[in-house]
Interface confidence: medium
């Protein structure tokens, strides 16, 4: 029977700057059944919090609602774990929620083939920023990726959109069924996962772009 | 050293305006959302207002609201309350307060206070 | 009328135990922390609790605070000369979008 070991705080992510979640890998519990408590300070601030939330993210989890998220200060957080033999403490972790946003994947991906008569014929991509995420406050630029692929095929052709919320493929093989996704970046922050995949068939007399 | 020093207070007739200031020192002002808090000599305290780091969101006790506006300078370090429609349930000891960090925390920082006569 | 409920006074002789309650409801204290401060006579308030049960560097451990459900309530143990003073509860109260206060209870040490 022996302390707890180091714990390790190994992620935090916030879907949109206003919540925030992290999570923590426990050390070996020293076979004795071991409490884990996150405590956190702001940068500038002298008192020293405990976690508000250990429900929200799951197991081995901390998370800070909207009342207790800051975007303009500096997280410092530390997990400690105890047993009937003692502490031990995670190395401290610095957290800057601009930094760690992970945003849901985009949302309503359409995919239609346009056949124009005067111009060549090209598939049309549409979708919607996350619902948490609010554009109109110009705290955010969303960029996002496309990537599509033939049914069969192992590899994707990845196009990258910007901040557009549409985009129009030329080069496709006729008589294919594609597979369309769509994710999201915040400009700091990490991609999103990718959008379910929307499938549409090319029809056979679709012309390939010189 | 966190310093928070209030003025303008004095004797105001009822129906009359008055503006207080609040100069603060020793931190980064505009890291930090504002309050004022007032004190009925004697008597409790009542929160009065609260604006944030910006100034982009302000709020009020529903015994001020419409009569008084809360705001502040960032070039200045200064937060102000203006205060108009003065009734004599408004006269008080007026503190400006400083948040420990993004609201809501508790206030650990707080001026000597300044006195409104109604 | 405040919007927290505090008995107005409390007293204690030197070194016994004495507490002081804070009665709210789910919008302010049942769903966010309590804070309690300390007012010396004549002089600005202080914070003496926060997060319902921690102590700010500086203030004795003699004074603990805890809450359930929609009531808290301040320890004051070893009762000493100097802790007389009026103390308040506070919360942030999500129904009204502002801070509420308790009326104060003024701690009287025999």
């Known amino acids: 029977q022996l302390p707890p070991g180091k714990p390790e705080i190994f992620k935090c992510r916030s879907p949109n700057k206003e919540t925030f979640t992290c999570w923590w890998r426990p050390g070996t519990d020293g076979g004795l059944p071991t409490n884990y408590s996150l405590t956190y300070h702001r940068e500038g601030e002298t008192l020293m919090h405990e976690c508000p939330d250990y429900i929200t993210g799951g197991p081995n989890s901390c998370h800070f609602g909207k009342q207790y998220t800051s975007m303009w200060r500096t997280y410092i957080m530390m997990v400690n774990a105890t047993n009937q033999m003692g502490s031990s403490f995670s190395d401290e972790l610095y957290v800057d929620v601009t930094y760690i946003v992970q945003p849901d994947p985009p949302l309503e991906l359409a995919v239609e083939v346009k056949q124009p008569e005067d111009r060549k014929p090209y598939l049309w991509i549409k979708w919607s920023p996350p619902t948490l995420i609010d554009l109109k406050t110009g705290w955010f630029t969303l960029l996002y990726e496309i990537r599509l692929k033939p049914e069969k095929a192992a590899e994707w052709e990845i196009h990258f959109a910007g901040q557009q919320t549409e985009f129009k493929i030329l080069s496709l093989h006729p008589g294919q069924k594609y597979l369309v996704q769509v994710r999201c970046k915040p400009d700091h922050g990490y991609w999103s996962a990718w959008s379910p995949a929307t499938f549409i068939q090319i029809p056979s007399d679709f012309t390939m772009n010189d | 050293e966190v310093q928070l020093l209030e003025s303008g207070g004095g004797l105001v007739q009822p129906g009359g305006s008055l503006r207080l200031s609040c100069a603060a020192s020793?931190?980064?002002?505009?890291?930090?959302?504002m309050s004022w808090v007032r004190q009925v000599p004697g008597k409790g305290l009542e929160w009065v207002s609260l604006?944030?780091?910006?100034?982009?969101?302000?709020y009020y006790a529903d015994s001020v609201k419409g009569r008084f506006t809360i705001s502040r300078d960032n070039s200045k370090n200064t937060l102000y309350l203006q205060m108009n429609s003065l009734r004599a349930e408004d006269t008080a000891v007026y503190y400006c307060?400083?948040?420990?960090?993004?609201?809501?925390?508790?206030?650990?920082?707080w001026g000597q206070g300044t006195l409104v006569t109604v | 009328q405040s919007v927290l409920t505090q008995p107005p006074s409390a007293s204690g002789t030197p070194g016994q135990r004495v507490t002081i309650s804070c009665s709210g409801s789910?919008?302010?204290?049942?769903?966010?922390?309590v804070y309690w401060y300390q007012q010396l006579p004549g002089t600005a308030p202080k914070l003496l609790i926060y997060?319902?049960?921690k102590r700010p560097s500086g203030v004795p451990d003699r004074f603990s605070g805890s809450k359930s459900g929609t009531s808290a309530s301040l320890a004051i143990s070893g009762l000493r000369s100097e802790d007389e003073a009026d103390y308040y509860c506070?919360?942030?109260?999500?129904?009204?979008?502002?801070?509420?206060f308790g009326g104060g209870t003024k701690l009287t040490v025999l």
């Open positions: 604006i944030s780091w910006d100034g982009g969101s302000t």
């Open positions: 020793g931190f980064t002002f505009d890291d930090y959302g």
């Open positions: 307060a400083r948040p420990s960090g993004a609201y809501p925390t508790p206030f650990d920082n």
């Open positions: 789910t919008s302010n204290i049942g769903s966010n922390y």
């Open positions: 997060d319902n049960n």
């Open positions: 506070a919360a942030w109260d999500d129904s009204l979008s502002g801070w509420v």
